[in-house]
């Protein structure tokens, strides 16, 4: 009996540019002789329904149809036909099929590969064209994929140390697609510093499918207006 097992749940998520290993384990009733077996990996893109051969291994020969694609002969001996794809790109997401032949038996399994890119976040202070006592803080998130992203603003005061979500005076712009397929978005918070307590900590909170925990960038309102340091104006606070 020959059986193939892919990633549990049927989906694998990998970061953009990572060297991804797409899992495929072989279960066979006898020890595997790699010289008399065949492995073929296929890929079907999210946009086209056509299946393309990515890699094949037959006994004493292997061929990559995607540069760098490989199945380890040394791992194959112990039943691991996983496919290594170095430098995975967004457009390589889709369905991957692992087909194993141990003549006369054949088994196969499929897995969905999702490629994600984590946002980088930075906080900027924009004072151009602002009224007296008014400041505009911009939270720029860039280089993320997929497009769906959630940006919120929170504040913590000495009176209320638990974060409170700010809903007023927040404008989040449209997402902009970059040349490489990733996205950027900017969220702005308008503050009237005369109405806020010094020592209040503000946070831009970014939630995205690529992140295990939200990305947080913060600044503290000081007694003197516009007293953010240069690093606070331009640097990442994640």
């Amino acid at each position: 009996d020959l059986k193939v097992e892919m990633m549990a749940g049927g989906t694998q998520i990998t970061p953009l540019n990572d060297n991804v290993t797409i899992f495929c384990n072989i279960f066979y009733s006898q020890p595997l002789n790699i010289t008399s077996m065949g492995i073929t990996w296929f890929w079907k893109s999210l946009t086209f329904d056509k299946e393309v051969k990515v890699f094949e291994f037959f006994g004493d020969h292997q061929e990559a149809f995607r540069p760098g694609a490989i199945v380890s002969p040394w791992r194959l001996k112990s039943g691991d036909a996983s496919l290594r794809l170095p430098g995975i790109q967004l457009e390589e997401a889709g369905e991957y099929r692992c087909e194993v032949v141990v003549t006369p038996l054949k088994a196969q399994g499929t897995v969905q590969l999702e490629v994600v890119a984590s946002p980088a976040s930075r906080l900027l202070l924009d004072q151009v064209g602002m009224k007296e006592n008014e400041d505009k803080y911009m939270c720029e998130s860039s280089g993320f994929y997929p497009e769906a992203i959630n940006i919120t603003w929170e504040k913590q005061t000495q009176k209320f140390p638990h974060p409170i979500e700010i809903s007023e005076d927040v404008i989040t712009g449209p997402t902009i697609k970059n040349m490489d397929g990733t996205f950027n978005v900017t969220s702005c918070l308008k503050l009237n510093s005369s109405q806020e307590d010094p020592g209040t900590v503000y946070q831009c909170v970014v939630r995205h499918a690529s992140l295990h925990t939200p990305l947080r960038s913060n600044f503290t309102l000081t007694a003197a207006r516009h007293s953010l340091s240069e690093t606070e104006k331009t640097d990442n606070f994640s």
Partner: antibody
Framework: EVQLVQSGAEVKKPGASVKVSCKAS????????MDWVRQAPGQGLEWMGD????????LYNQKFRGRVTMTVDTSISTAYMELSRLRSDDTAVYYC?????????????WGQGTTVTVSS | DIVLTQTPLSLSVTPGQPASISCKAS??????????MNWYLQKPGQPPQLLIY???TLHSGIPDRFSGSGSGTDFTLKISRVEAEDVGVYYC?????????FGQGTKLEIK
Amino acid sequence: EVQLVQSGAEVKKPGASVKVSCKASGYTFTDYNMDWVRQAPGQGLEWMGDINPNNGGTLYNQKFRGRVTMTVDTSISTAYMELSRLRSDDTAVYYCARSEVFYGNYADYWGQGTTVTVSS
Amino acid sequence: DIVLTQTPLSLSVTPGQPASISCKASQSVDYDGDSYMNWYLQKPGQPPQLLIYAASTLHSGIPDRFSGSGSGTDFTLKISRVEAEDVGVYYCQQSKEDPRTFGQGTKLEIK
């Protein structure tokens, strides 16, 4: 920085078992196999087998089959090698070594070694 | 099992002079156009360290005075100019077939 840190020296009686650990850090544990190689006093190197942390699959040198068990705990990036029914000629330094398996096959980083002495 | 035979078994070299070690396999260690022969150096009191893999590829951080060549059954490790820090035992290893086997080792000493 890639590091393989092995457990300390062991003294065992003939017939007993020994379990050596190898804690890996500085790389993705499942991307490489772990080889186990031993070296008897004043002798050369002898490959005992390897384990694939990706699926727990093992390949053992026939010489040790039935006596050696290699395992991994991926949650703590640690590989283990247990040798049972010890004999005096099992006295050796036991090494774990990270093994590249996709672009060739070679042991590029080695643990410091664990001395196992079998004596009555 | 593939048997690897190294020659010479010991070598005494003057610093700055070249050195050469041969490794002969009992059968070919080539597969699909590549040679699965590796070279290691074990310095006194230390674990082995990788020098050369796939017959001729220098491992990162290894000085380029080390070089490897050969295919099929005949392989050579060369040191263009021996230095005092090169002392130890040199091993060839094949990784084409299991069990992966090592040569018996060549001891390099400085004159």
